[in-house]
């Protein structure tokens, strides 16, 4: 997260880290005791999932292996549409005040809505600085029409843009798959942006979760 702030401890109990060994690979969001939602471009053969701590690599955090993941069947590695994936944990999470599932959206929030994005991604760009603490940034949803002025045909129908005019605050490497939460519901998953990160008026681009609720529910049901 560029130009963000340290999240209030325990305020993101649904936030998870997908680790490759001990190294951060992507962010993710707990949606059920067995399931984590993340970006399709984060796919690996297997995952070490850290839950219940704002510190990356925290020894006291829950760590659960995951060997199965289900990319949206329409994900395109060329256009990056449908950049969403469900990761099934090998064993259920122990829910607590530090580990909770996020609320999935009942509707799509409108442009101008205030939201918070979080992650352990680099806080500087192009040189990288990875924080140990979970970082947050407050951003507002931007209309497709406005966002298309910047990204033109790169912006797919189910992509959502967020940012603050003239501000550097944004997501970056390592934040992928992490949550954009608006009015206590999951509205976006970090998908992509321009590089170096934090260029004013280049919004962060997210997968618009409200368009995928049915796919999420059906996939979890099918692979119970």
């Amino acid at each position: 997260i560029i130009d963000g702030y340290k999240c209030k401890e325990g305020s993101h109990p649904w936030q998870v880290a997908l680790l490759k060994g001990n190294q951060l690979h992507c962010g993710g969001v707990l949606v059920d005791k067995y399931w984590v939602l993340t970006a399709a471009h984060c796919k690996m053969g297997q995952y070490q999932v850290q839950l219940g701590s704002d510190k990356i690599g925290d020894q006291s955090a829950q760590k659960i292996k995951a060997t199965k993941s289900f990319r949206h069947p329409g994900y395109s590695t060329k256009t990056h549409v449908n950049d969403i994936m469900l990761v099934r944990l090998d064993e259920p999470v122990k829910m607590s005040s530090k580990v909770e599932a996020v609320q999935l959206p009942e509707h799509c929030e409108p442009p101008g809505t205030s939201c918070t994005v979080s992650g352990w991604g680099t806080t500087t760009s192009p040189d990288v600085t990875f924080p140990s603490d979970l970082m947050c940034s407050d951003v507002k949803l931007i209309s497709s029409r406005e966002c298309k002025k910047v990204y033109k045909d790169l912006l797919g129908k189910t992509m959502l843009c967020a940012g603050i005019p003239d501000s550097k605050t944004n997501t970056c490497n390592g934040d992928s798959g992490g949550p954009l939460v608006c009015n206590d519901t999951l509205q976006g998953l970090v998908s992509w942006g321009t590089y170096p990160c934090g260029q004013p008026n280049d919004p962060g681009v997210y997968t618009q979760v409200c368009k995928y609720k049915r796919w999420v529910m059906e996939t979890m049901k099918t692979h119970r």
Partner: antibody, heavy 127, light 108 residues
Framework: QLQLQESGPGLVKPSETLSLTCTVS??????????WVWIRQPPGKGLEWIGS???????YYNPSLKSRVTISVDTSKNQFSLKLSSVTAADTAVYYC???????????????????WGQGTTVTVSS | DIQMTQSPSSLSASVGDRVTITCRAS??????LNWYQQKPGKAPKLLIY???SLQSGVPSRFSGSGSGTDFTLTISSLQPEDFATYYC??????????FGGGTKVEIK
């Protein structure tokens, strides 16, 4: 500032393996953010991409050369290398190493532009 | 593979002229198009990335435009040091990364 320097034999015999090394100075090759690229240019011709490698060791090769190419990274020496097997006269070229700077992050991390280049090394394939 | 076609392959121009070089992709590459300048015996140098963004340190007389399949590099007022060969390059997720055939800008 970052500099790249190619090194290796200037003359290789047909059917042998061409081996080149690119030494990176003024920055770390293990940076999460970059690709390391090999490109060649036959005499009087245009540029041809050979292949790239990223920080994690994932490689991307030109399909037309894939069966003969190996690119690897040695982070301890801050170097990356090219091996091209079974060379013929058609492999005679100036070989460049370059840094690929991503144009996006996240799902768009794979798109890049070569922003820093070595000065190139001439390799002639001849008996 | 995506083919990149540059035109013209060569052109003659005078100092102060406005020069336009075009690059056409065989299929849409969005804005993932970069331009390089190469002088004889030297390595290529990045001028423009993402179709229209000027690389740091490159004079503002260079500009790029286009999206999808058709792209343009413009030199607004040609300077003596601009006589060189120019290449476009597309950067896909899927290999191969490909270059155009080059445009040689010569002195009239």
């Amino acid at each position: 500032q970052l500099q790249l320097q190619e090194s290796g034999p200037g003359l290789v015999k047909p059917s042998e393996t061409l081996s080149l090394t690119c030494t990176v100075s003024g920055g770390s090759i293990s940076s999460l953010d970059y690709y390391w690229v090999w490109i060649r240019q036959p005499p009087g011709k245009g540029l041809e991409w050979i292949g790239s490698i990223d920080y994690s060791g994932d490689t991307y090769y030109n399909p037309s050369l894939k069966s003969r190419v190996t690119i690897s990274v040695d982070t301890s020496k801050n170097q990356f290398s090219l091996k091209l097997s079974s060379v013929t006269a058609a492999d005679t070229a100036v070989y460049y190493c370059a840094r690929g700077r991503p144009l996006g992050y996240g799902a768009r991390h794979y798109y890049y532009a070569m922003d820093v280049w070595g000065q190139g090394t001439t390799v002639t394939v001849s008996s | 593979d995506i083919q990149m076609t540059q035109s013209p392959s060569s052109l003659s121009a005078s100092v102060g002229d406005r020069v336009t070089i075009t690059c056409r992709a065989s299929q849409s590459i969005s804005s993932y198009l970069n331009w390089y300048q190469q002088k004889p015996g030297k390595a290529p140098k990045l001028l423009i990335y993402s179709a229209s963004s000027l690389q740091s340190g490159v004079p503002s007389r260079f500009s790029g435009s286009g999206s999808g399949t058709d792209f343009t590099l413009t030199i607004s007022s040609l300077q003596p040091e601009d006589f060189a060969t120019y290449y476009c390059q597309q950067s896909p997720y899927f290999p191969p990364l490909t270059f155009g055939g080059g445009t040689k800008v010569e002195i009239k």
